[in-house]
Amino acid sequence: SGTTNTVAAYNLTWKSTNFKTILEWEPKPVNQVYTVQISTKSGDWKSKCFYTTDTECDLTDEIVKDVKQTYLARVFSYPAGNVESTGSAGEPLYENSPEFTPYLETNLGQPTIQSFEQVGTKVNVTVEDERTLVRRNNTFLSLRDVFGKDLIYTLYYWKSSSSGKKTAKTNTNEFLIDVDKGENYCFSVQAVIPSRTVNRKSTDSPVECMGQEKGEFRE
């Protein structure tokens, strides 16, 4: 059932990385527009992206107010040019999203190797502490500020001359690894939240190799 020429949204999907969170849906509108509402389980509905012809809505500003809440969104369909029109039940046609809990589900963004420094047969590799869109006292919090001990990093490293990879883990943003003197190594890191059941790992960082400008060498 529904209003003439109006179809309900479907395939409502949350796309979220480091808490930047967008709701996407189908279909591309033909003679209709959409409005999105978002709510916590116990809260009131808040409308966003009014009468849009887009099939996505950025809900980041709402979810970063409390990333540990569980959110539900719904997408309303209205006939273009007649947004007062309602469905057969006296309400606009709408579809609910799956529930979304940002703290447990947001994807971890691709990390970046900030620097590496070799001293003799040791290399210190430092990972950039990525900024999120979660605020505290008007400053953006880092991934570590939000996740704390839940967040670890895995380092993959290998000799430039071979393909055999070694791994190391840290619950800080620094690794101190042993290397063979005179050999060049390449590095890639991954952010991991071991306590999660979904979206536990980020994609690997871009590879950085010794002998390139990010690194420093000291005898």
Epitope: K41, D66, K68, Q69, T70, T101, Y103, L104, T126, V127, E128, D129, R136, L141, S142, R144, D145, V146, F147, G148, K149, D150, L151, N171, T172, N173, E174, P194, S195, R196, T197
Partner: antibody, heavy 120, light 113 residues
Framework: EVQLVQSGAEVKKPGESLRISCKGS????????IEWVRQMPGKGLEWMGD????????NYSPSFQGHVTISADKSISTAYLQWSSLKASDTAMYYC?????????????WGQGTLVTVSS | DIVMTQTPLSLPVTPGEPASISCKSS????????????LTWYLQKPGQSPQLLIY???TRSSGVPDRFSGSGSGTDFTLKISRVEAEDVGVYYC?????????FGQGTKLEIK
Amino acid sequence: EVQLVQSGAEVKKPGESLRISCKGSGYTFITYWIEWVRQMPGKGLEWMGDILPGSGSTNYSPSFQGHVTISADKSISTAYLQWSSLKASDTAMYYCARSGYYGNSGFAYWGQGTLVTVSS
Amino acid sequence: DIVMTQTPLSLPVTPGEPASISCKSSQSLLYSGNQRNYLTWYLQKPGQSPQLLIYWASTRSSGVPDRFSGSGSGTDFTLKISRVEAEDVGVYYCQNDDTYPMTFGQGTKLEIK
């Protein structure tokens, strides 16, 4: 209002099993770590372990690993601490606590404690 | 495990006077990525559950009076009470909130002279 309500005092004999509970309310139970802390009579605080109810992931202090089990039932917002075989040295006050909103920001809310007495 | 060492273990104070408690950790609690120190302070009043006073070494928890302040970095930390009141009596604990297992100091008992 955030609340952690713990089960009542228990008196047990050595070798018996026990499960005590901690029910959370006033917040999203699945996204905050529940911590368990022991305080033996007249002594200080000892961290035992914790659980993230949303995933069931646990961490234990090496001092308690293998002697206690931490679990949670997110459908009723309750975390548990259990022993399969109690010892007299388990006599203590046991507190549950909830982690803070930010990472590594302390144990922001505490239950009232459950006194466990183990004596033959 | 990180060992937390508090001094003094007993602290008799006259009401209205300042008080200071030291806490030293066996490893640095400073996280270089965001320059935060993951050191927490609690107060356990007689017959009560502990309560959070300060996290991130210097951030007061909501509702904690501003006479309480935390400072320090790395391995050396201090909790100060600018003017002690009768209700501040109890045992103060510092805690490593940086690394598992999360260890507590042995406690400092503040009493009124």
